[in-house]
Interface confidence: low
């Protein structure tokens, strides 16, 4: 009796230690991807950024993966996402190419399944970045909470890349699981 | 017999209700500082804000300790950082030392096993604020999820301090649990 | 004798899956709310932004309540808020009632109880948008953690509303629920 | 709530201190302004004190009042060298930025008579 | 300093009044506006020029930004006869009256 007591308690610790696994806190998905600035395309046009860290430094990866520049979502679920993009100039890097620049971020969801692309999130400033001072900074910070399915993709777009800060604190972006989906 | 299942059912119910206190979501800590107005220090030197609110308007904190102007981590796991800063300046204040003003945060870690700090985040602009203008103001916002282990702390600097504004809806930081470590 | 724990075990089951269910991610309260472009007032003062959308594209709301413009709060909790507004003028738009502009964004909390309105967070800049550029833009991002109760709303108010980007990426606001109050 | 007292009759150059009490709320958070208004007249902003502590005055009161506060729950209104153009109702007031003054006193009248 | 105007004004029952506030710098949203009755201290209408103080009926409104400001009553009615003041919160420095010189409404 006692014997089948305890196989009945085991069973349903077991069943509540499934549960709990699932619903762990650290069971959520995440990343904090910097940018990689050895590969920095050049130009002021707008471009798709591929080169990013996932595993050094700040930048760290959880039950999402990393590939061919995206960030490729495993988990259905509701995430937060955020990205922080710095553009410097210093006049000893030249002369720009134009003192009117457009400095601007859009964070992109790409879905497989059909084929399409759409921005989430976008942000960013003109700026007038005059030769009479020698340093020029800006940055954009943008955030928000999306449903995503396993399998999209989340990627960052910037004009002006040539003019990225290329530290690790200050051109990132990342995501993290909040909730599932109902 | 039944007595003896009330007692194994009672085993079972009480170390579920441990794993659960020890999972709810009210025991992840969190921190909402806003800046206190009365010790910011003056000129546009990059300086460590040490003067913050923890219990006041906005302001609190659960599970982390606020100490020496330093936010304390008590608890390892993985936190969203965050920090809005204002600035502004009004003729009334007087002149502007230069018109040409570099507008900065800077969100830090330090470690106190391993003495050392690094900046987490950084955010900011390059200003021209113009003697054409009587009042100028500039925010910025950054965000981020890392990796904080206990005793690990959190500051914040900014460059021209004497520009923040003292409105709590304007100069703060602030932190949130989102899972353990695995 | 085996009847009577099977009872008792379904007793156990039953308990704690009403406590999962409770505590469970998918039950915490969201939003995500994007401009609604149809209704953007004119002009360049101060104003609350009643028009958004809850149900179409990236918006979508759970366990909260979008009624008059603002956005309600259903469960007791803390929250991370976050709000992205964008602005823009291109000079076929006409000419801008002054090249000075204040672009600002608030956050603001209002309790029905106590009828009194509070400013949660604010952003925004001080542009000098001349006629020497044809088109000009800028973002504001904030975001912060607040203990939020439930009848309590949410809105927000920004100046120069007749330059707000109408893109759903571009100007939005949110909410979602991180842990219980203690 | 906010009160304020200690207003009378005095002779000019007289030193007078007033008083504002407050209770439900705290001068370790908020900042308290005083005010001031002559018979028939409008307001004047005196000047106000930060929860730090830190006194600040219209261009006009500077060397004439000095705000202080006392206690946890008072602050002072000190009234250097009065004269009769001082001779008005003081009203103590929580606030003074973007709330505005939230929270006022009834007023005590102070009158400066040789 | 404020500029408040008119000095006076005289509304009959059921009528709009407009009293007009210029700052002497740009102030942005940082004003308020008081209702104060004989012998009453005033009493906080509007603050960050637009927000309505708790308790106040919707009949009062605050626009502007920067340096020019309005208060508006729509539908007067006879307890509305008072002074109406606005007031700068945003700077203390330099400065002679964060008050402006009232404006006394008058219901017939």
């Known amino acids: 009796g006692s014997q089948h007591i305890r196989a009945e308690k085991a069973m349903v610790d077991g069943s509540w230690l499934d549960l709990a696994k699932r619903s762990k806190l650290e069971a959520q998905p995440f990343a904090h991807l910097t940018i990689n600035a050895t590969d920095i395309p050049s130009g002021s046009h707008k471009v798709s950024l591929s080169s990013w860290y996932h595993d050094r430094g700040w930048a760290k990866i959880s039950n999402m993966t990393f590939s061919n520049g995206k960030l490729i979502v495993n988990q259905d679920g509701f995430y937060y996402l955020y990205a922080n993009i710095c553009f410097r100039h210093h006049e000893t890097s030249g002369d720009l190419a134009t003192e009117y620049l457009q400095l601007m971020v859009y964070v992109t969801k790409t879905s497989i399944k059909i084929p399409s692309s759409h921005t989430l999130m976008k942000g960013g400033s003109t700026k007038y970045w005059s030769g009479n001072s020698e340093f020029h900074f800006y940055s954009i910070n943008v955030g928000g909470f999306f449903k995503l399915r396993s399998g999209e993709e989340i990627s960052i777009e910037v004009s002006n890349p040539s003019l990225l800060d290329p530290d690790q604190d200050a051109t990132y972006f990342g995501a993290f699981k909040v909730r599932d989906i109902d | 017999g039944s007595q003896h299942i009330r007692a194994e059912k009672a085993m079972v119910d009480g170390s579920w209700l441990d794993l659960a206190k020890r999972s709810k979501l009210e025991a992840q800590p969190f921190a909402h500082l806003t800046i206190n107005a009365t010790d910011i220090p003056s000129g546009s030197h990059k300086v460590s804000l040490s003067s913050w609110y923890h219990d006041r308007g906005w302001a609190k904190i659960s599970n982390m300790t606020f100490s020496n102007g330093k936010l304390i981590v008590n608890q390892d796991g993985f936190y969203y950082l965050y920090a809005n800063i204002c600035f502004r300046h009004h003729e009334t204040s007087g002149d502007l030392a230069t018109e040409y003003l570099q507008l900065m945060v800077y969100v830090t870690k330090t470690s106190i096993k391993i003495p050392s700090s690094h900046t987490l985040m950084k955010g900011g602009s390059t200003k021209y604020w113009s003697g054409n203008s009587e009042f100028h103001f500039y925010s910025i916002n950054v965000g981020g999820f890392f990796k904080l282990r206990s005793g690990e702390e959190i500051s914040i600097e900014v460059s021209n301090p004497s520009l923040l504004d003292p409105d709590q809806d304007a100069t703060y930081f602030g932190a949130f649990k989102v899972r353990d470590i695995d | 004798g085996s009847q009577h724990i099977r009872a008792e075990k379904a007793m156990v089951d039953g308990s704690w899956l009403d406590l999962a269910k409770r505590s469970k991610l998918e039950a915490q309260p969201f939003a995500h709310l994007t401009i609604n472009a149809t209704d953007i007032p004119s002009g360049s003062h101060k104003v609350s932004l009643s028009s958004w959308y809850h149900d179409r594209g990236w918006a979508k709301i759970s366990n909260m309540t979008f009624s008059n413009g603002k956005l309600i709060v259903n469960q007791d909790g803390f929250y991370y808020l976050y709000a992205n507004i964008c602005f823009r003028h291109h000079e076929t738009s006409g000419d801008l009632a002054t090249e000075y502009l204040q672009l600002m964004v608030y956050v603001t909390k209002t309790s029905i109880k106590i009828p009194s309105s509070h400013t949660l967070m604010k952003g925004g800049s001080t542009k000098y948008w001349s006629g020497n550029s044809e088109f000009h833009f800028y973002s504001i991002n904030v975001g912060g953690f607040f203990k939020l109760r439930s009848g309590e709303e949410i809105s927000i108010e920004v100046s120069n509303p007749s330059l707000l980007d109408p893109d759903q990426d571009a100007t939005y606001f949110g909410a979602f629920k991180v842990r219980d109050i203690d | 709530s906010v009160e304020e007292s200690g207003g009378r009759l005095v002779t000019p150059g007289t030193p007078l201190t007033l008083t504002c009490t407050v209770s439900?709320?705290?001068?370790?958070?908020?900042?308290m302004s005083w005010v001031r208004q002559a018979p028939g007249k409008g307001l004047d902003w005196i000047g106000y004190?930060?929860?730090?502590?830190?006194p600040y005055y219209a261009n006009w009161a500077k060397g004439r009042f000095t705000i202080s506060k006392s206690s946890s729950t008072t602050v002072d209104l000190k009234i250097t060298s009065p004269t009769t153009e001082d001779t008005a109702a003081y009203f103590c007031?929580?606030?003074?930025?973007?709330?505005?003054?939230?929270?006022w006193g009834p007023g005590t009248l102070v009158t400066v008579s040789l | 300093d404020m500029t408040q105007t008119p000095a006076s004004v005289e509304v009959a029952v059921g009528g709009t009044v407009t009293i007009k506030c210029q700052a002497s710098?740009?102030?942005?949203?940082?004003l308020a506006w008081y209702q104060q009755k004989p012998g009453q201290p005033p009493k906080l209408l509007i603050y960050?020029?637009?927000t309505l103080a708790s308790g106040v009926p919707s009949r009062f409104k605050g626009s502007g930004s920067g340096t020019q400001f309005t208060l508006t009553i729509s539908g007067v009615q006879c307890d509305d006869a008072a002074t109406y003041y606005c007031?700068?919160?945003?700077?203390?420095?330099?400065?002679?009256?964060?008050f402006g010189g009232g404006t006394e409404v008058v219901v017939k």
């Open positions: 439900g709320f705290s001068l370790s958070s908020d900042v």
């Open positions: 960050g020029a637009s």
């Open positions: 004190i930060w929860s730090g502590g830190r």
């Open positions: 007031q700068q919160g945003y700077s203390v420095s330099n400065i002679d009256n964060a």
């Open positions: 710098q740009n102030i942005g949203y940082n």
């Open positions: 007031a929580r606030g003074f930025g973007s709330s505005g003054l939230n929270i």
